[in-house]
Interface confidence: medium
């Protein structure tokens, strides 16, 4: 390449508990940093599908060090969803950044090197308000199911025993 290229680093920051409790909304923030040049496209994906509703992205990348002529760039974007949607640990959120540059191995030629697209992503899973993660949520569901089945089994056994005792009592009463 004619000029050095730096792909972005991407991170997703989860919404704050304060925002969720006060507004019943949840804002996820995506931050792409350290890229050069400033040719990027950012998109949000929820459960594998690209979303546009509730998305607010900076109009253009900003220099990380404005005073420097050759500063790397950063770009931020926000995705706002309802608190209940965020608190469902089955929901998957992904911020994807497409970076247009030349890969380290591409040779720059006099007729220009063909730019390549690098995709860098970061993700987050919904988080229940009691601090469940997706894994602990699944484990919790499993535990709850087992507990329910045990209680149901106990109740059934109890019902059978009570029924048996009632029947026995009725038979004894007929004998008298």
């Amino acid at each position: 390449d004619l000029n050095k290229v730096f792909p972005p680093e991407v991170a997703v920051f989860e919404p704050s508990e304060a925002e969720i409790s006060h507004t019943q909304k949840a804002t996820l923030v995506c931050l792409a940093t350290g890229f050069f040049p400033d040719h990027v496209e950012l998109s949000w994906w929820v459960n594998g599908k690209e979303v546009h509703s509730g998305v607010s992205t900076d109009p253009q990348p900003l220099k990380e060090q404005p005073a420097l002529n050759d500063s790397r760039y950063c770009l931020s974007s926000r995705l706002r969803v309802s608190a209940t949607f965020w608190q469902n640990p089955r929901n998957h959120f992904r911020c994807q950044v497409q970076f247009y540059g030349l890969s380290e191995n591409d040779e720059w030629t006099q007729d220009r090197a063909k730019p390549v697209t690098q995709i860098v992503s970061a993700e987050a899973w919904g988080r229940a308000d009691c601090g469940f993660t997706s894994v602990s949520y699944q484990q919790g569901v499993l535990s709850a199911t087992i507990l329910y089945e045990i209680l149901l089994g106990k109740a059934t056994l109890y019902a059978v025993l009570v029924s048996a005792l009632v029947l026995m009592a009725m038979v004894k009463r007929k004998d008298f």
Partner: antibody
Framework: QVQLVESGGGVVQPGRSLRLSCAAS????????MHWVRQAPGKGLEWVAV????????YYADSVKGRFTISRDNSKNTLYLQMNSLRAEDTAVYYC?????????????WGQGTLVTVSS | DIVMTQTPHSLSVTPGQPASISCKSS???????????LYWYLQKPGQPPQLLIY???NRFSGVPDRFSGSGSGTDFTLKISRVEAEDVGVYYC????????FGQGTKVDIK
Amino acid sequence: QVQLVESGGGVVQPGRSLRLSCAASGFTFSSYGMHWVRQAPGKGLEWVAVISYDGSNKYYADSVKGRFTISRDNSKNTLYLQMNSLRAEDTAVYYCAKDLGGSGGAFDIWGQGTLVTVSS
Amino acid sequence: DIVMTQTPHSLSVTPGQPASISCKSSQSLLYSDGKTYLYWYLQKPGQPPQLLIYEVSNRFSGVPDRFSGSGSGTDFTLKISRVEAEDVGVYYCMQSIQLYTFGQGTKVDIK
């Protein structure tokens, strides 16, 4: 601040050699492609040569190919132009220029230039 | 080689009036990445050139908004909405889709 300073110009006889230098400061020299552009007295601009940020790729205008060599020393933040077999038509002000960055193309920073006169 | 042709060769403008410079390339400057590699420079008397416009229409940092670039393919225009005394000099267009070629320049002075 961002600065490019050329040196090494002067009067030289046809067929002789000259080496121009360009000292860079105020930016990360090793991240950018660098160019030499010249301007004959009273004439327009003519691009001469380019070198990639790491020195691995070099290209030249047909008018200087085989005679001029562009090089760089990133440890010294310096760009060079070795000019051999000089001709009268090489007489010009030689500017070094920094590439704008990205996929390349524009020259965003220029030096003040150094005059090379080829004359017997 | 790509040839860049500028018109007019020179231009005399009254301060406050608009000015327009045309630049034509011998082949399209649109590249496969969707960008058009056409640039405008101004060389003021006794100074090195300075970048005004990159990729057809983007003003370089610090360039006044009275300068604007337009065009596509092979035909491009630089416009100065209201010429000021400090705008005098020679304007060059340049392509960088296949190495680098400048137009022959357009000299702008004040009436």
